[in-house]
């Protein structure tokens, strides 16, 4: 058993039929010595008396808010949560496996630049009685500070008969060094509590591996005289690290016909303009990627040829 | 050329070669997420590689103030990786494919290090760790780790030279 926060404790249980469970001793936080009784949740049934209560925790019915009283007055509370371990593996019931980029990916994180700011998100089908707490650091043995905000519900999607909820959190490295080569990964830890179930999820990454620039901005077309060619121009996204002479991007320009089956013409360039042939009803799209490190491409910025 | 005394390197040449190094490093180990190398235990391997750290002056301001600190750190790293790529980690079993970009990568590391430090000038270099993995699978894992680490290193070096070519060239 360990303390998650004040008066909230996590009991780690091997979860299998007829498991013996864990013996837990609760102590009433009071100078009083006698006349103390214990109850669980809203029930008025007295579970025991005395300053300490010894319980065998085997299942969710044994978890909950234990309260010690004296003469009708509440003295203190202890909330017991369960962390299930099945076949040696901690349960992951609360969050959905996003399966990208690999199986057992529960947390996904992205950064728009090298400033040390990043966003992580996760999915669940659970809509109520759910809380998240996020902590992060750079490195684990001698951790350096990363400050995370509160997790918020960022999207709600309908998946068949069920809804799926996306939560996200923003974190910022306290002393970020955008130009340095990272040697210690960022660690992100999410505590999830649904009713009386506790679970924790972790992710470890370098900022450079989760970079995904915003799409190029101000995408414009300039027809060239007496030609089917157009000059496409764009700018670095505002959110990208500066100076651009140091934090450079590379770009992919694509001409795509109306039909998805039509052949796509693609040009790669380090410049912020390119000359392409504009076909009728086609559109021109541009996306960006770090020039020197192959992290994710941005989403496409698009304009119609006409 | 970057002479220890402090004259400027051939920024544009260094820029071109470092960008080529980036391309080669990624073609040598293109599978991002092929395996999470941090899950495989970091042993003494990549802990010993020279990283370009915050105080090394490789940021835009540090380069403007005095690029020598940064160039020396980059040089150290290039020599280190050049030695690693020439060691039995890469020459031993399992053999690299004949068209593997590792050979080109090795040569380009050497080329860039020579651009930074011509013969007769000596910056101190970092001692290469004695890594002699006994099993072929250990060697393979070590190659992946080294190449992943090299990708990060050459990306920073390429940014330095691109910025230098754009802002510090005479």
């Amino acid at each position: 058993i360990w303390e998650l926060k004040k008066d909230v404790y996590v009991v780690e249980l091997d979860w299998y039929p007829d498991a013996p469970g864990e013996m837990v001793v609760l102590t009433c936080d009071t100078p009083e010595e006698d006349g103390i009784t214990w109850t669980l949740d809203q029930s008025s049934e007295v579970l025991g008396s005395g300053k300490t209560l010894t319980i065998q925790v085997k299942e969710f019915g044994d978890a909950g808010q234990y309260t010690c009283h004296k003469g009708g007055e509440v003295l203190s509370h202890s909330l017991l949560l369960l962390h299930k371990k099945e076949d040696g593996i901690w349960s992951t019931d609360i969050l959905k496996d996003q399966k990208e980029p690999k199986n057992k990916t529960f947390l996904r994180c992205e950064a728009k630049n090298y400033s040390g700011r990043f966003t992580c998100w996760w999915l669940t089908t659970i809509s109520t009685d759910l809380t998240f707490s996020v902590k992060s650091s750079r490195g684990s043995s001698d951790p350096q500070g990363v400050t995370c905000g509160a997790a918020t519900l960022s999207a709600e999607r309908v998946r068949g008969d069920n809804k799926e909820y996306e939560y996200s959190v923003e974190c910022q490295e306290d002393s970020a060094c955008p130009a340095a080569e990272e040697s210690l990964p960022i660690e992100v830890m999410v505590d999830a509590v649904h009713k009386l179930k506790y679970e924790n999820y972790t992710s470890s990454f370098f900022i450079r591996d989760i970079i995904k620039p915003d799409p190029p901005k101000n995408l414009q077309l300039k027809p060239l005289k007496n030609s089917r060619q157009v000059e496409v121009s764009w700018e670095y996204p505002d959110t990208w690290s500066t100076p651009h002479s140091y934090f450079s991007l590379t770009f992919c320009v694509q001409v795509q016909g109306k039909s998805k089956r039509e052949k796509k013409d693609r040009v790669f360039t380090d410049k912020t303009s390119a000359t392409v042939i504009c076909r009728k009803n086609a559109s021109i799209s541009v996306r960006a990627q770090d020039r020197y490190y192959s992290s994710s491409w941005s989403e496409w910025a698009s304009v119609p040829c006409s | 050329r970057a002479v220890p005394g402090g004259s400027s390197p051939a920024w544009t040449q260094c820029q071109q070669l470092s960008q080529k190094l980036c391309t080669l490093a990624w073609s040598a180990h293109p599978l991002v997420g092929h395996m999470d190398l941090r899950e495989e235990g970091d042993e003494e391997t990549t802990n010993d590689v020279p990283h370009i750290q915050c105080g090394d002056g490789c940021d835009p301001q540090g380069l403007r103030d005095n690029s020598q600190f940064c160039l020396q750190r980059i040089h150290q790293g290039l020599i280190f990786y050049e030695k690693l790529l020439g060691s039995d980690i890469f020459t031993g079993e399992p053999s690299l494919l004949p068209d593997s970009p590792v050979g080109q990568l090795h040569a380009s590391l050497l080329g860039l290090s020579q651009l930074l430090q011509p013969e007769g000038h000596h910056w101190e270099t970092q001692q290469i760790p004695s890594l002699s993995p006994s099993q072929p699978w250990q060697r393979l894992l070590l190659r992946f780790k080294i190449l992943r680490s090299l990708q990060a290193f050459v990306a920073v070096a390429a940014r330095v030279f691109a910025h230098g070519a754009a802002t510090l060239s005479p």
């Epitope: 949740d41 809203q42 299942e59 969710f60 669940t124 809509s127 109520t128 069920n162 009713k195 | -």
Partner: antibody, heavy 117, light 108 residues
Framework: QSVEESGGRLVTPGTPLTLTCAVS????????MIWVRQAPGEGLEWIGI?????NTYYATWVKGRFTISKTSTTVDLKMISPTTEDTATYFC??????????????WGPGTLVTVSS | FELTQTPSSVEAAVEGTVTIKCQAS??????LSWYQQKPGQPPKLLIY???KLATGVPSRFSGSGSGTQFTLTIGDLECADAATYYC???????????FGGGTEVVVV
């Protein structure tokens, strides 16, 4: 601590109807409330809940046919455009207070709604 | 999400025992309650958290199970136990909520 439904009557299809659940002996700001219905000779079917903070959650089949709202002492169920399939006894119940998704330990006697032309 | 109750109807003698099963289509941990309903009356809570007896309910009623399989057992049957019994999952309103189809208990 009690709850009591009212407003059930005979209506023609398409005529909106609002059922009211009056509560006494407890505060709606402490408990989840649920509306459940039971067609003649059938089982219990949950319609929706309103949490202590006023958030509403509906069963997937509801699809905008009902809305739940509350005041300080009442919980309303509005039937937007009833059909004959909505003929049932409608129950209001109070949660235990432990959770939003809760079990229910205080039930009203129910109010009968008949939808017929 | 589905809660399947079996059997739909059961007949038992006074002083006998009845077992009703409730199966969830996914794990709901122990977030299951049982209700008793008599004709013309609202449901009455018997069991919550799969096995905890509600206030004032005789100990002849007991609940067990967790995950997806749950059981309500009524021992030492009385005529007053003739009613329809419903299980209810309250895991989450989106990811596992609702009532079972009901089991009619006839006491002979």
């Amino acid at each position: 601590q009690s709850v009591e439904e009212s407003g059930g009557r005979l209506v023609t299809p398409g005529t909106p109807l609002t059922l009211t659940c009056a509560v006494s002996g407890f505060s709606l700001s402490d408990y989840t409330m649920i509306w459940v219905r039971q067609a003649p000779g059938e089982g219990l079917e949950w319609i929706g809940i309103i949490s202590s903070s006023g958030n509403t959650y509906y069963a997937t089949w509801v699809k905008g046919r009902f809305t739940i709202s509350k005041t300080s002492t009442t919980v309303d169920l509005k039937m937007i455009s009833p059909t004959t399939e909505d003929t049932a006894t409608y129950f209001c119940a109070r949660g235990s207070g432990a959770y939003i998704s809760d079990y229910f330990n205080v039930w009203g006697p129910g109010t009968l709604v008949t939808v017929s032309s | 999400f589905e809660l399947t109750q079996t059997p739909s109807s059961v007949e038992a003698a006074v002083e006998g025992t009845v077992t009703i099963k409730c199966q969830a289509s996914q794990s709901i941990d122990s977030w299951l309650s049982w209700y008793q309903q008599k004709p013309g009356q609202p449901p009455k809570l018997l069991i919550y958290a799969a096995s905890k007896l509600a206030t004032g309910v005789p100990s002849r009623f007991s609940g067990s199970g967790s995950g997806t399989q749950f059981t309500l057992t009524i021992g030492d049957l009385e005529c007053a136990d003739a009613a329809t019994y419903y299980c209810q999952s309250y895991y989450d309103v989106n990811a596992g909520y609702g009532f079972g189809g009901g089991t009619e208990v006839v006491v002979v």
